[in-house]
């Protein structure tokens, strides 16, 4: 099938999401003559790169080429050879690399330089690798989900594409959770903002959007766990940390040097009388929740309303799509159903966290222990972040939709990023040519 003539002119694009815990490659395709229409671009492939995030390759940059090979070769197979040279490739690095750059611009540059050299060796049209800002990450995630939900389309459908799609043109807010940061982006009711840093203005398909966005660096699930451990070990009487966020019977040794490696734990750093400590799980949701809440400073707010850490947050408005780790964790815990109330989620979390580690390992034999051990913390963290961090309530919980894919495309910032860089989101509504939309309405 590699070199068969295509029945219609199809274009392709590749985006690599270089996250803090892993890298994923996404391949998108669309009909060339409809590239300014809304909703025509869709994902044809996701390839998860084997190994950690690129920021972990700082000590072994010579391995980056091999690390990227499998997924880049997969792209070579999926995209017809005749299209290779005109297929753009973009790599966006997120919070893991922001943290590395905070420690050392030289090391971040070195990693990106090697990544760029590696990606330039492929027959595609490589457009560069860069660290995207938290604001971009939030904005492009918001664009992605609303594009896929058809919110930018001016046509009124008589049917819904997805269960939670309403026929109105009200956009969805975007809640994104990664390993090192989390983003909240939505259109608030009040157009005026108290914090210009959190304000974005777009004109898309002939309509103006005043969007609020904020990226909380260090509040992704992995860095939040490091923060919690660094905070809790401060008051431990010896090198044993009895931790309510891990299952009863769970044990793990942590190196203090690993704990203080990240800038995220800087505020909790202290000289400890030991080089290692042992986490001993006690599996108590309520205590875990209390410990997590201590990561959110809600005592200081220079605005009318804040999320936490003095960051402005306008009143929540409308429905929200919660994706990436919000979805992965809640899906694992079987809590993504629209019918599950916030009270029920809390109840299930209490039950899950209190289950003995040996029992959990038996029940989920196919899951890597490193990931399996952290679901109690991650689930508790998600609840705390949404309820106490972002001020969702038991009532507004029903406005959160945990989304993995929409129409076969992953929810996340990559599609929005590519749409923007390929100029596929026009500011004005394109003039419809006869039958141009016949294929999908």
């Amino acid at each position: 099938t590699q070199n068969k003539a295509l029945p219609e002119n199809i274009k392709y694009g590749i985006v690599l999401d270089a996250g803090s815990s892993h890298t994923s490659l996404y391949i998108y395709k669309w009909p060339a003559e409809k590239e300014n229409d809304t909703g025509v671009v869709h994902q044809v492939e996701e390839c998860r790169v084997k190994g950690p995030g690129i920021s972990k390759y700082v000590q072994k940059v010579n391995e980056i080429g091999i690390y990227l090979t499998d997924c880049m070769e997969r792209a070579r197979e999926v995209i017809p050879r005749s299209q290779h040279q005109e297929t753009p490739v973009y790599l966006g690095a997120t919070a893991g690399m922001r943290l590395l750059r905070m420690e050392s611009e030289e090391l971040a540059d070195r990693v990106l330089d090697v990544v760029e050299r590696s990606l330039s060796n492929y027959p595609f049209d490589f457009q560069g690798a860069r660290i995207i800002t938290g604001q971009e990450e939030g904005a492009y995630g918001w664009i992605t989900i609303n594009y896929l939900l058809g919110k930018f389309s001016q046509k009124t459908r008589w049917f819904s594409i997805v269960p939670y799609e309403t026929n109105n043109q009200e956009t969805f807010g975007a809640l994104d959770l990664g390993g090192a940061s989390t983003q909240i982006t939505f259109v608030p009711q009040n157009q005026t903002t108290e914090s210009p840093d959190n304000a974005l203005q777009f004109r898309l398909y002939g309509k103006d959007y005043n969007v609020y966005t904020h990226s909380f660096l260090c509040y992704g699930k992995d860095q939040a766990l490091w923060q919690k451990l660094a905070k809790d070990i401060q008051v431990a009487s010896n090198e044993i940390l009895r931790d309510p966020c891990f299952h009863p019977g769970y044990k793990k040794v942590v190196n203090v040097s690993d704990l203080y490696k990240t800038p995220c734990t800087k505020r909790f750093e202290m000289t400890l009388p030991f080089q290692q400590f042992e986490i001993q799980g006690i599996g108590n949701y309520q205590q875990c929740h209390q410990s997590v809440l201590e990561l959110f400073n809600t005592s200081y707010c220079p605005y009318s309303q804040c999320a936490f850490n003095g960051i402005f947050l306008p009143p929540l408005q409308g429905d929200f799509g919660a994706f990436s780790a919000f979805y992965f964790v809640m899906n694992f815990l079987n809590l993504t159903s629209e019918k599950v109330s916030q009270e029920k989620v809390t109840e299930m979390m209490k039950k899950f966290c209190s289950q003995p580690w040996e029992e959990i390992k038996t029940s989920y034999a196919g899951v890597k222990e490193k990931y399996l051990s952290e679901y109690c913390f991650s689930g508790t963290y998600i609840l705390s972040l949404l309820l106490q961090g972002y001020h969702f309530t038991a009532d507004s919980w029903e406005h959160i939709h945990f989304i993995g894919k929409i129409q076969g495309s992953d929810a996340g910032w990559t599609l929005g990023y590519m749409l923007n860089l390929t100029n596929m989101i026009p500011a004005e509504q394109p003039l419809s040519t006869p039958l141009s939309h016949s294929t999908y309405v």
Epitope: S104, E106, L107, T133, G134, L217, K266
Partner: antibody, heavy 116, light 111 residues
Framework: EVQLQQSGPELVKPGASVKMSCKAS????????MHWVKQSHGRTLEWIGY????????TFNQKFKGRATLTVNTSSRTAYMELRSLTSEDSAAYYC?????????WGQGTLVTVSA | DIVLTQSPASLAVSLGQRATISCRAS??????????MYWFQQKPGQPPNLLIY???NQGSGVPARFRGSGSGTDFSLNIHPMEADDTAMYFC?????????FGGGTKLEIK
């Protein structure tokens, strides 16, 4: 365009304290550390320490530890340095500089004169 | 602490000629394949201005006549051809480990 705007000159008495500011613009304030550097006699440069604006954690040159305090106000994108128990040895220009390991952007400096 | 010894303390060079300033570290400032060595130019009444980072990379907007080289413990800054505007103080700095340290400075003048 990245800019660091520092507060004006200070004339202080020995034994007193001084608090200077550094207002940042043109970048995401919490994405970079803020360093402070002392320059005396127009020649000797000494690194005082840095703060992580993201969470307020700081690291100091042992020489200044206990006498210097670094703080930030993220909503106003401003970093502060307070120096206590001043002596004539502290008369110098003090600079803030943005960076992890690369000090690519510097404030214009705050001149501190300690005199009875 | 890593001590940086800069030499010479002062230097006078004719216009169009080459100026070479050296900086020796008391221990290697290399880590993960990167040299954490920097060169700054400072003119009276101004803050230091980054010329070279990572031992040999030119800072933003820095003219090509400023070249940095070296690795490990021995580094140098070369200015060629020397121009009148290059009269200034020059400092080396290491950020491999805390406390970050600076060299004593070199005063460069026109002969």
């Amino acid at each position: 365009e990245v800019q660091l705007q520092q507060s004006g000159p200070e004339l202080v008495k020995p034994g007193a304290s001084v608090k200077m500011s550094c207002k940042a613009s043109g970048y995401t304030f919490t994405d970079y550390n803020m360093h402070w550097v002392k320059q005396s006699h127009g020649r000797t440069l000494e690194w005082i320490g840095y703060i992580v604006p993201l969470n307020g954690g700081s690291t100091f040159n042992q020489k200044f530890k206990g006498r210097a305090t670094l703080t930030v106000n993220t909503s106003s994108r401003t970093a502060y340095m307070e120096l206590r128990s001043l002596t004539s040895e502290d008369s110098a220009a003090y600079y803030c500089a943005r960076g992890g390991t690369r000090f690519a952007y510097w404030g214009q400096g705050t001149l501190v004169t300690v005199s009875a | 602490d890593i001590v940086l010894t800069q030499s010479p303390a002062s230097l006078a060079v004719s216009l169009g000629q080459r100026a070479t300033i050296s900086c020796r570290a008391s221990e290697s400032v290399d880590n993960f394949g990167v040299s954490f060595m920097y060169w700054f130019q400072q003119k009276p009444g101004q803050p230091p201005n980054l010329l070279i980072y990572g031992a040999s990379n030119q800072g933003s907007g820095v003219p090509a006549r400023f070249r940095g080289s070296g690795s490990g413990t021995d580094f140098s800054l070369n200015i060629h051809p020397m121009e009148a505007d290059d009269t200034a103080m020059y400092f080396c700095q290491q950020t491999k480990e805390v406390p970050y340290t600076f060299g004593g400075g070199t005063k460069l003048e026109i002969k």
